[in-house]
Amino acid sequence: MAVTACQGLGFVVSLIGIAGIIAATCMDQWSTQDLYNNPVTAVFNYQGLWRSCVRESSGFTECRGYFTLLGLPAMLQAVRALMIVGIVLGAIGLLVSIFALKCIRIGSMEDSAKANMTLTSGIMFIVSGLCAIAGVSVFANMLVTNFWMSTANMYTGMGGMVQTVQTRYTFGAALFVGWVAGGLTLIGGVMMCIACRGLAPEETNYKAVSYHASGHSVAYKPGGFKASTGFGSNTKNKKIYDGGARTEDEVQSYPSKHDYV
């Protein structure tokens, strides 16, 4: 029961996280015009990974895509790459984890295969989350650096008469969405890895135990405790004794109709 819950929750948390990473990547508000200590402008600037936008107080909004690859800062390209890698890994992880879910039966898939798939998806979610967090953090660092650089020369005087107001940018909503989403994907991945251990617990084999009815001597051959990681070829649960109480995870679930979208 606990394993199924952990796996299911891990999947849902990762799903929300990846949806958040996709949303953050598509959002235009990665950096927004800093309004603090600035003259009240009738124009509000904000920028995303793919385009920059200007919203006028009139309500008119205009967005322009970055129609160049070579002209863009390397850091921006790196952030784009990290977010895309995060999305791709997350999407593959989701696909793998759907088939790994204990509540879904596909043919005669063994628990060992499900355990492997759960671990694979978990690792993918962890890497996906880390990519998103790294991408957002790199962008945030870039913003902080630029913010203080522009603050240093915020007003550039022209002959002491005319002033040009430098537009400073601060953290946009997409950064917070990205951090939270990356964190959720990471947590979901960890949960999947934990669930994987439960799917294939450490194997305890009681080998070559012979009981002699006649006589007083009992021969006991310790076969050792074969420590299994659960990811080997022989990961089938070999239970010698059964106390009678079965957990939900131990009950064999038979193929049934499932609607999964």
Epitope: Q33, P39, V40, T41, A42, V43, N45, Q47, S52, C53, V54, E56, S57, S58, G59, F60, E62, R64, V162, Q163, T164, V165, Q166, T167
Partner: antibody, heavy 118, light 113 residues
Framework: EVQLVESGGGLVKPGGSLRLSCAAS????????VSWVRQAPGKGLEWVST????????YYADSVKGRFTISRDNAKNSLYLQMNSLRAEDTAVYYC???????????WGQGTSVTVSS | DIVMTQSPSSLSVSPGERVTISCKSS????????????LAWYQQKPGQPPKLLIY???TRESGVPDRFSGSGSGTDFTLTISSLQAEDVAVYYC?????????FGAGTKLELK
Amino acid sequence: EVQLVESGGGLVKPGGSLRLSCAASGFTFSNSAVSWVRQAPGKGLEWVSTITSGVSYTYYADSVKGRFTISRDNAKNSLYLQMNSLRAEDTAVYYCTRQFKGNALDYWGQGTSVTVSS
Amino acid sequence: DIVMTQSPSSLSVSPGERVTISCKSSQSLLNSGNQKNYLAWYQQKPGQPPKLLIYWASTRESGVPDRFSGSGSGTDFTLTISSLQAEDVAVYYCQNDYFYPLTFGAGTKLELK
């Protein structure tokens, strides 16, 4: 056709109050920022106040801040300017305008005259 | 507040002549986000409300004759009437559309010689 029709002007004593109204038609009022601009007799144009669409941010000229209040009723397609503590220097023709691209005032009403005199 | 300085305050021009009106702002009206200058030009004829001619410093409003053109960037702007017509007699105003308060220039009165 875009139309802006002002009303509510008149003669008022210094310190008195007046409420100007502007009825808008021919465009999506709720999606537009609208402003009041005034013009004293024989003088130039002076921007008074703006109210944006959506969250309805309000902006005022320093000369009217704390005395005038701009508001809107999107259901009635109406813009209002509540003018309190009126002074002689508030005497002007008040125009209701729509803000559009570039924050420029692309449509203007015919104006309503406000005279503050004892 | 942004100060808009218009010059000349008045000018007398013969029909068919080229007219240039200057407008200077105390701060740059150029927005770095879209590289547009937030300055508008208006025409006001006697007894009428003002009419928008130019926005974004150089974009002509629909219905405005092409003899009217706007230019300039940052702090210095110009309204040009390539060939003055009798119906162009009016007062012309520039306006800062970038910073609140949205200040106007004092106006330039254009008369026929």
